[in-house]
């Protein structure tokens, strides 16, 4: 990440604490899901690649008034060092694909579990 007038760096690879907490929260959401998550709101699908945390936040931040994912939105902001706001568009979104929040959370959870198993905490 680079930014005019400033300097951004990826920093050292952190311990697994933060990733584990995020995974636990996503597990919690999927297990406690009764009615459709966030009333079946749709969000942009993302490429689960480098920059995924910011892209996931940019997608989920467009869902407002859904207390079930507020903690996840906050946690993702703790992974993403630049400012994210509703309406923002990331090149990491799959432009023509929208999916339900519940599916988005499941896909993200599967990918994060894979990263955790492989020891890729950053």
């Amino acid at each position: 990440l680079t930014c005019l007038g400033g300097f951004a760096s990826p920093g050292p690879v952190p311990p697994s604490t933060a990733l584990r907490e995020l995974i636990e929260e996503l597990v919690n959401i999927t297990q406690n899901q009764k009615a459709p998550l966030c009333n079946g709101s749709m969000v942009w699908s993302i490429n689960l690649t480098a920059g995924m945390y910011c892209a996931a936040l940019e997608s989920l931040i467009n869902v407002s008034g859904c207390s079930a994912i507020e903690k996840t939105q906050r946690m993702l902001s703790g992974f993403c060092p630049h400012k994210v706001s509703a309406g923002q568009f990331s090149s990491l979104h799959v432009r023509d694909t929208k999916i339900e929040v519940a599916q988005f959370v499941k896909d993200l959870l599967l990918h994060l579990k894979k990263l955790f198993r492989e020891g890729q905490f950053n």
């Epitope: 951004a8 903690k71 993403c80």
Partner: antibody, heavy 120, light 112 residues
């Protein structure tokens, strides 16, 4: 309740380094950015940079590149700033403050500040 | 870097008066995502700064409604409708739209 507890005041020699800490409690540490701000005696405030604790990624004020290093220890919910090659210009109070995405990244809670005095 | 210029430097007021502090940025502080990350902080002697206003006009929880923020683009204002003794201190505007984020030079609110 949310608290950011900073390490005690420090007197250091010119040319030395110092590492200041900011221990967070009362909230999920990895969900909020930590900013560092400098205030020289009788002067205004200067933003040094921030760190996203979940990833360890940082944004810096170019003026402090090479001077300040920001890190976190998520297991102890503590943020650190290391200041190197200290000179009298670095004598200041250093604050840590967290940013909340739901307050448009405003700095809603601040530490009490750590005073660093560089003197021989 | 974005220069934030506050006026006046010192603002002597009588308790109960209205106070107005101006903050001008050297360029637009509208972020690329469309938001204006302009905040106001109050620092009392020997204390850490405290958040008053975020995103130009939103009051932080617990901040009395006598504090209000307004403005857009490059021109911003903090108003205190009826100054109380606890309001005295140094007020700083802050832009978080462009790195490096920058503070204004401060305005000292004091008793006339």
């Amino acid at each position: 309740q949310v608290q950011l507890q900073q390490s005690g005041d420090d007197l250091v020699l010119p040319g030395a380094s110092v590492k200041l800490s900011c221990k967070a409690s009362g909230y999920t540490f990895t969900s909020y950015w930590i900013n560092w701000i400098k205030q020289r005696p009788g002067q205004g405030l200067e933003w040094i940079g921030h760190i996203a604790p979940g990833s360890g990624s940082t944004y810096f004020n170019e003026m402090f590149k090479g001077k300040a290093t920001l890190t976190v220890d998520t297991s102890s919910s503590t943020a650190y700033i290391q200041l190197s090659s200290l000179s009298s210009e670095d004598s200041a109070v250093y604050f840590c403050a967290r940013s909340d995405i739901f307050l448009s990244y405003a700095m809603d809670y601040w530490g009490q500040g750590t005073s660093v005095t560089v003197s021989s | 870097d974005v220069l934030m210029t506050q006026t006046p430097l010192s603002l002597p007021v009588s308790l109960g008066d209205q106070a107005s502090i101006s903050c001008r940025s050297s360029q637009s502080i509208v972020h690329s995502n469309g938001n204006t990350y302009l905040q106001w902080y109050l620092q009392k002697p020997g204390q850490s700064p405290k958040l008053l206003i975020y995103k130009v006009s939103n009051r932080f929880s617990g901040v009395p409604d006598r504090f209000s923020g307004s403005g857009s683009g490059t021109d911003f204002t903090l108003k205190i409708s009826r100054v109380e003794a606890e309001d005295l201190g140094v007020y700083y505007c802050f832009q978080g739209s462009h790195v490096p984020y920058t503070f204004g030079g401060g305005t000292k609110l004091e008793i006339k």
